[in-house]
Amino acid sequence: TPEVWVQVQMEATELSSFTVHCGFLGPGSISLVTVSWGGPDGAGGTKLAVLHPELGTRQWAPARQARWETQSSISLALEDSGASSPFANTTFCCKFASFPEGSWESCGSLPPSSDPGLSAPPTPVPILRAD
């Protein structure tokens, strides 16, 4: 069964910078990736980036750079200019489409131990979901 993994990582050098890494585990080629974010329990979500293997990428603030890492994984750099606890309680979701097979989504958030005062980010743990 295809699966999607998501890692959310705080940059060690800049506490207001985050990176979301997402990947697809399964057969087939990726036709589109959509990254979205919002509050817990599906509240107040919106798109951050859309990546098409041929047509390119589009991103919306606070996304800084969306890019393909491999043919089946992407990364999205985020810049937070807000409060002292950046992206706290924020859920990031990645949805990979493989046409015509189907599409799969998984979501993740910054691990609770990611205190802005830490000198280095924690090791991100993949979150897997197969619906």
């Epitope: 919002g38 599906g42 979500g45 859309v50 047509l55 489409a97």
Partner: nanobody
Framework: EVQLVESGGGLVQPGGSLRLSCAAS????????MSWVRQAPGKGLEWVST????????SYVDSVKGRFTISRDNSKNTLYLQMNSLRAEDTAVYYC????????????????????WGQGTMVTVSS
Amino acid sequence: EVQLVESGGGLVQPGGSLRLSCAASGFTFSYYDMSWVRQAPGKGLEWVSTINSDGGRTSYVDSVKGRFTISRDNSKNTLYLQMNSLRAEDTAVYYCVEGDPHNFGLESLSLRDFGSWGQGTMVTVSS
């Protein structure tokens, strides 16, 4: 796995109304823009309407403006298309899709350019 299941299609007389529904599962529906696209017999895929994630912004192709209304109920994970004053030229298979084709300014659409897609529901407008 993401699933989008359309319903509500059928045969209707010109001037009549139909309400299409799209039940979504397997993803965080409330985070995503959703659209309706259609494919008339022997024609290519045509964008019909898009609604943003919270339902606050909608857009329509000129040919359906004032006749069709897109809406969503995020608490029910459902997308709707209310179609009034139907015309013969509205006859098509209607697909519920995740995404907004305007992201890339697509002129010739394909279902593969969307993040998720349903199996479609047939709407026939005929007397």
